[in-house]
């Protein structure tokens, strides 16, 4: 066979699917890979073949389309599963060709198991509300064109293991589930469970979310340097060494990169000759505010690292923030006793 | 199915003390804010009090006639809420209910314990 | 605190015949997020209280369609399409905006 454009094998697109349940699975060729559509690749001639390599197996076969009420179908640019078996996890290709073309891409189908609380080795979306920000809602995911809209599903949702009826502050609306004012514990796994007529049967389509409730965008302030401040003054003899933490509280911003940074003499640490060394560590609360403190180390200082301006920096969507440490050399004590010794001896 | 179930009443003399438990099954407690609802023979409902999750900080509130002599209490380990009444006067004989949530209104409701405080 | 206020205190009603029960709050009950704090809830006798409407117009599961609730602000309405036999009790309006947490005093249905 002429040589066919082989775009491996797309990890990228881990797609994880609950066993006994419908899946369709759109060929990524057209998604990600090539610059046409299907309508497009059929219109010209081009052909649309599935196969597959089961679990633990190197054989590539052909999909077979004629199992009972057509369990695996295929519509368009779509493998459908009416519904998924455990053992039919594995890579699947899709490959476009016809006599002069041909391109093809493996994925990984994991066909995945759940227990009775929808409790699954799923990967889960995470989908953040704001802290009592107004009424926030979160869509049941992923059930486009699995049924007309002429069908009317019925959508129950949980969280964690029970129904959602009306609790505190969460009202389910059909494939809407609304949080009158998100609040800490609100945050979970949330499940919708859809289930629709098809030809004379009834599937269930499960989703499940994780919730996490995060800062309110209301409450947000530019970065806060809490050290270095005016209150410590960092006193060192040379020799000594000298650590200067810089704490700086973040209130949480979506999509906000938070930086922090020292300047030694207006320069970054790493553009200057002094033996520095810088370590980071960050915290979380509970509403994803974060905490970061980067220390400053100098092991032995010297009387003109003493003499430096050390500033730490730090920056988030919100805005810029500065602040001086207080660095200075200590004076050596009076050596009152050599000077009473002296005095004594003179009366 | 939710379910609460109130435990813990009697007949006490006036200045006496009781204490009433409401066990939750059916959902995750944790999460709940969770009432105490009292409804003296004959009258309305008066709330008693609340407590939220402790996620959502623990917070406690009480009706000014119980502030002081009742304590609200939870125990998310067991599924349980508490109501501590000291210092009881005739005027707290009612039946007492423990009730869910709050801002949606109470959604699940105890079949209720009577205290009567009578000397 | 807020006073909740409803009328009329009694209402005997005819089975089949509407119904109509009014709340008033000393306060506007509208949330800053735009819900009414506000719910209804029937005693039936003998019973735990059980809730019917919350946030002023949203029905509880598993309340029958004849029962709805309007209003916003300070003024509230319970309404019941065709009283049934069943819907004899003492019914409330609560508040929920803010602690302490308040009822109305009651409107006992009767079936005349």
């Known amino acids: 066979s002429e040589r066919c454009d082989d775009w491996g094998l797309d990890t990228m697109r881990q797609i994880q699917v609950f066993e006994d349940e419908p899946a369709r699975i759109k060929c990524p060729l057209f998604e990600h890979f090539l610059k046409f559509n299907y309508s497009t690749a059929h219109s010209a001639g081009l052909t649309l073949i599935w196969y597959w390599t089961r679990q633990d197996r190197d054989l590539e076969e052909p999909i077979n389309f004629r199992l009972p009420e057509n369990r695996i179908s295929k519509e368009k640019d779509v493998l459908w599963f009416r519904p998924t078996l455990l053992n039919d996890t594995g890579n699947y290709t899709c490959m476009l060709r016809n006599t002069t073309y041909c391109s093809k891409v493996a994925f990984p189908l994991e066909v995945v198991q759940k227990d009775s609380c929808f409790n699954s080795p799923m990967k889960l979306p995470v989908h953040k509300l704001y802290i009592e920000y107004g009424i926030q809602r979160i869509t049941c995911p992923n059930v486009d064109g699995y049924f007309p809209s002429s069908v009317k599903p019925t959508i129950t949702w949980y969280m964690g293991c029970y129904k959602i009826q009306n609790f505190n502050n969460v009202i389910p609306e059909g494939m809407n589930l609304s949080f009158l004012i998100a609040l800490i514990s609100n945050n979970g796994n949330y499940t919708c469970v859809v289930t629709y007529p098809e030809n004379g049967r009834t599937f269930h389509l499960t989703r499940t979310l994780t919730v996490k409730v995060v800062g309110s965008p209301k409450n947000a302030v530019p970065p806060v340097i809490h050290s270095p401040n005016d209150h410590v003054v960092y006193e060192k003899e040379p020799g000594e060494e000298l650590l200067i933490p810089c704490t700086v509280y973040f209130s949480f911003l979506m999509d906000s990169r938070n930086e922090v940074w020292w300047t030694i003499d207006g320069k970054k640490p790493d553009d200057i000759t002094i033996d520095v060394t810088i370590n980071e560590s960050i915290s979380h609360s509970r509403t994803e505010d974060e905490t970061r403190t980067q220390i400053l180390s100098i092991k032995k200082v010297t009387s003109e690292d003493l003499k430096r301006s050390y500033v730490c920096h730090a920056r988030s969507a919100k805005g810029e923030v500065a602040k001086a440490a207080k660095v200075k050399q200590k004076v050596p004590a009076p050596r009152y006793t050599v000077e009473l010794a002296c005095g004594f001896g003179a009366t | 199915e939710v379910q609460l179930v109130e435990s813990g009443g009697g007949l006490v003399k006036p200045g006496g003390s009781l204490r009433l438990a409401c066990a939750a099954t059916?959902?995750?407690?944790?999460?709940?804010?969770m009432s105490w609802v009292r409804q003296g023979s004959g009258k309305g409902l008066e709330w008693v009090g609340r407590i939220k999750s402790k996620a959502d900080g623990g917070t406690i509130d009480y009706a000014a006639p119980v502030k002081g002599r009742f304590t609200i209490s939870r125990d998310d380990s067991k599924n349980t809420l508490y109501l501590q009444m000291n210092s009881l006067k005739t005027e707290d004989t009612a039946m007492y209910y423990c009730t869910t949530g709050e801002l949606l209104g109470f959604d699940y409701w105890g079949q209720g314990t009577l205290v009567t405080v009578s000397s | 605190d807020i006073v909740m206020t409803q009328s009329p205190l009694s209402l005997p009603v005819t089975p089949g015949e509407p119904a109509s029960i009014s709340c008033r709050s000393g306060?506007?009950?509208?949330?800053?997020?735009?819900?009414?704090?506000l719910a209804w809830y029937l005693q039936k006798p003998g019973q735990s209280p059980q809730l019917l409407i919350y946030?002023?117009?949203n029905r509880a599961s598993g309340v029958p369609d004849r029962f709805s609730g309007s209003g916003s602000g300070t003024d509230f309405t319970l309404k019941i399409s065709r009283v049934e036999a069943e819907d004899v009790g003492v019914y409330y309006c609560?508040?929920?905006?803010?602690?302490?947490?308040?009822f109305g005093q009651g409107t006992r249905l009767e079936i005349k």
């Open positions: 609560m508040q929920t905006l803010q602690t302490p947490i308040t």
């Open positions: 306060q506007s009950l509208l949330h800053s997020n735009g819900f009414n704090c």
């Open positions: 059916g959902f995750t407690f944790s999460n709940v804010w």
């Open positions: 946030l002023g117009s």
